[in-house]
């Protein structure tokens, strides 16, 4: 049955017959109302106040009508749709393409995809009529997305008489002479010839190589980027690109330093359903960087739970330095990672020994001054972790990074619900906690306990009558991460270290200050 | 290959003060260290800089006078020594560091003079 | 500040010969994270010193097999087996275990 639409020719976005919706007007603060009749949009001026409550992503402003409940967002440069969720500027997707919200609309047959709004796909599956439609990048665009985790984006296109999916053509990151790798490299074409011991790797057309499997006379030789040239590669599906050396006159194969593109403090973030003491029960895939962290007691048999852990590279964990007092050997540690349910395995988690850890050598066991500590994963090669949706790091911040006060932040933890009680969280849970300004984070605010220059303090600054739930970490939580959004990217601030009670209204939480120790860090985890 | 490119001799006045730049190419995450030799002398550590983070570690004797800074989107790192005196006329090398100090730059002459 | 002690200053050798660079540290240069950064590097006349041995023991690439290291704790060695006329130079150790990290004073090996 045909239908007669509205396209709006400033934002590309369709309507139906007697649909109206609202639009900012460029480079002015004014809003038009616009309805859809007989095709044509007609528009006016319409009065407008500020949102009652956030709505627009990346910075935008939201204004809702004044008279009735639509609301519009005025995107900042290189943001576009409704709640200002369209990246205009990304021009590749990273990884299987889920956090992808670029603005390709081409499938591989060249066909144009489909606005998610069509009526025409109201049955499919995915369509941007979900009530998660913002949350899985659809809406009133007809850009390729990946809302099912399928292996790249996609989008329906209307062939053979029907709307089927198909995928796109949208440029993956990792093509092209990237000097950089995602996931194992397999997709890497970049020009690094250096292994990790500093070795030359030699030509894929050596004659050396004569035998071996993959060399520029593979059949599929170009197809895996090899040829004559002596660039690292991965043409086996190994856990990162390599090439072909002689040592000490011997034929063999080394891991490459290639780098591998930074996809730190990217996440599947979805909104947490359930309320608990203290915060909001959350899945792991929203905090992909927590590490549960169990160690074998000399007392006890099997292993208890000891502390939160953050995953800041492939092979290196942060934690407190107050969770190794025990001074447990390594090999009594255990850290997973891609857990949802403390003690209940992950379909997807990642299960390491521990090969060594480092205590700051000045920790303070009184004042929890300099409370950090790095442990290295064991592995047999120089990965450990494999990034997923569940297993990713966090970014590091930047030596600078100097955030406004009362920024929003976010920590995670298996923690107790609160201070008295037994028992630690069976789940993982978040807490929203703001960052109190240095005037604010001083001895006399904490009952005198020293507070030190290496610390930061968060809280939940809601008004708490008797019964509000505030927001906080609590026993159990120590080691893991505070993390706030910096540039588009969850970025580590703080550790979660100590404080007095939990989610008591005014008592700030206390963390490690992560920026006084980004060179101590990086000096530790050289090779 | 990772190849740093430096910056040109200077000659400067004591009081004064100097910027050296090393221009790195290859796989840059690695941290830049700055190493100086007066002449006929040996070589003298004077800090580090990550390039990813911008974290910095300084030899005493340089903190307060030295400061090294990163620009990553032209893969260049820059060490300015301020306050200049005779004794700072030396060649100023960056070195890059992943498993040891690898990568040399050419070295750039500083010369204090009145 | 770890002190690093080279012996001798200055060492002439004939060609084909053996020749050993001793390096003294002021105290144990093992790093917090069980490595030991101790590192040989050459400086040719007129050129920027390069890389030949790091962690101890580990040849840089391309440097021949003719150069080792050994040592632990306070006191390591490199060893030429046997030098050649192009090995002519100063021989720094250095360490980078403990801020600030440090150069030996240099030993110049000159051919006899």
């Known amino acids: 049955s045909y239908q007669v639409i509205c396209r709006d020719e400033k934002t590309q976005m369709i309507y139906q017959q007697h649909q109206s919706w609202l639009r900012p007007v460029l480079r002015s603060n004014r809003v038009e109302y616009c309805w859809c009749n007989s095709g044509r949009a007609q528009c006016h001026s319409v009065p407008v106040k500020s949102c009652s409550e956030p709505r627009c992503f990346n910075g935008g402003t939201c204004q809702q009508a004044l008279y009735f409940s639509d609301f519009v967002c005025q995107c900042p440069e290189g943001f576009a749709g409704k709640c200002c969720e369209i990246d205009t500027r990304a021009t590749c997707y990273e990884d299987q393409g889920i956090s992808y919200r670029g603005t390709w609309s081409t499938a591989e047959s060249g066909a144009e995809c489909t606005n998610w709004n069509s009526s025409a796909l109201a049955q499919k599956p995915y369509s941007g009529r979900r009530p998660d439609a913002i949350r899985l990048g659809l809406g009133n665009h007809n850009y390729c997305r990946n809302p099912d985790r399928d292996s790249k984006p996609w989008c329906y296109v209307f062939k053979a008489g029907k709307y089927s999916s198909e995928f796109c053509s949208t440029p993956a990151c990792s093509e092209g002479n990237s000097d950089c790798y995602f996931g194992n490299g397999s997709a890497y074409r970049g020009t690094h010839s250096l292994t990790e011991s500093g070795a030359s790797c030699l030509p894929w057309n050596s004659m050396i190589l004569i035998g071996k499997v993959y060399t520029a006379q593979n059949p599929s030789a170009q197809a895996l980027g090899l040829g004559k040239h002596n660039y690292c590669r991965n043409p086996d599906g190994d856990a990162k690109p390599w090439c072909h050396v002689l040592k000490n006159r011997r034929l063999t194969w080394e891991y490459c330093d290639v780098p591998s593109c930074s996809t730190c403090g990217l996440r599947q973030y979805s909104q947490p359903q359930f309320r608990i003491k203290g915060g909001l029960f959350a899945d792991i895939a929203s905090h992909p960087w927590q590490a549960a962290i169990f160690a074998k007691h000399r007392r006890s048999p099997g292993e208890r739970f000891l502390c939160g852990g953050i995953l800041i590279s492939s092979c290196w964990i942060l934690s407190a330095a107050h969770c190794f007092q025990e001074r447990f050997p390594p090999h009594h540690l255990t850290v997973i990672l891609g857990r949802t349910y403390r003690v209940v395995p992950g379909e997807e988690e990642q299960k390491f020994e521990v090969e060594k850890y480092i205590v700051h050598k000045e920790f303070d066991d009184d004042t929890y001054d300099n409370d950090i500590a790095l442990l290295q994963l064991k592995s047999d090669s120089s990965r450990c972790a494999q990034e997923s949706s569940v297993v990713r790091t966090v970014c590091l911040p930047p030596a600078d990074l100097q955030l406004p006060d009362w920024t929003e932040c976010e920590l995670s933890g298996y923690g107790k619900h609160e201070a008295l009680s037994p028992f630690y969280s069976e789940r993982l849970k978040e807490a929203h906690v703001r960052l109190y300004p240095s005037s604010r984070c001083t001895s006399q605010h904490l009952l005198n306990r020293t507070v030190t220059d290496n610390m930061l303090c968060a809280g939940d600054t809601r008004s708490g009558g008797p019964q509000a739930n505030l927001h906080d970490a609590c026993q159990g939580d120590s080691g893991g991460p505070l993390v706030c959004l910096n540039d588009g990217r969850m970025t580590l601030v703080g550790i979660i270290s100590w404080g007095l009670g939990c989610g008591q209204k005014d008592v700030p939480g206390v963390y490690t200050k992560v920026t006084n120790y980004l060179d101590w860090i990086r000096d530790n985890m050289r090779p | 290959q990772v190849q740093l490119v430096q910056s040109g001799a200077e000659v400067k006045k004591p009081g004064a003060s100097v910027k050296v730049s090393c221009k790195a190419s290859g796989n840059t995450s690695y941290w830049i260290n700055w190493v100086r030799q007066a002449t006929g002398q040996g070589l003298e550590w004077m800090g580090r800089i990550d390039p990813g983070g911008g974290s910095t570690g300084y030899a005493q004797k340089f903190q307060g006078r030295v400061t090294m800074t990163v620009n990553t989107s032209i893969s260049t790192a820059y060490m300015e020594l301020s306050s200049l005196r005779s004794e700072d006329t030396a060649v100023y090398y960056c070195a890059s560091y992943y498993y040891a100090m690898a990568y040399w730059g050419q070295g750039t002459l500083v010369t204090v003079s009145s | 500040d770890v002190v690093m002690t080279q012996s001798p200053l200055s060492l002439p050798v004939t060609p084909g010969e053996p020749a050993s660079i001793s390096c003294r540290s002021s105290q144990s240069i093992v790093h917090s994270n069980g490595n030991t950064y101790l590192d040989w590097y050459l400086q040719k006349p007129g050129q920027s010193p390069q890389l030949l041995i790091y962690?101890?023991?580990n040849r840089a690439s391309g440097v021949p097999d003719r150069f080792s290291g050994s040592g632990s704790g306070t006191d390591f060695t490199l060893k030429i087996s046997r030098v050649e006329a192009e090995d002519v130079g100063v021989y720094y150790c250095f360490q980078g275990s403990h801020v600030p990290w440090t150069f030996g004073g240099g030993t110049k090996v000159e051919i006899k």
């Open positions: 962690k101890v023991s």
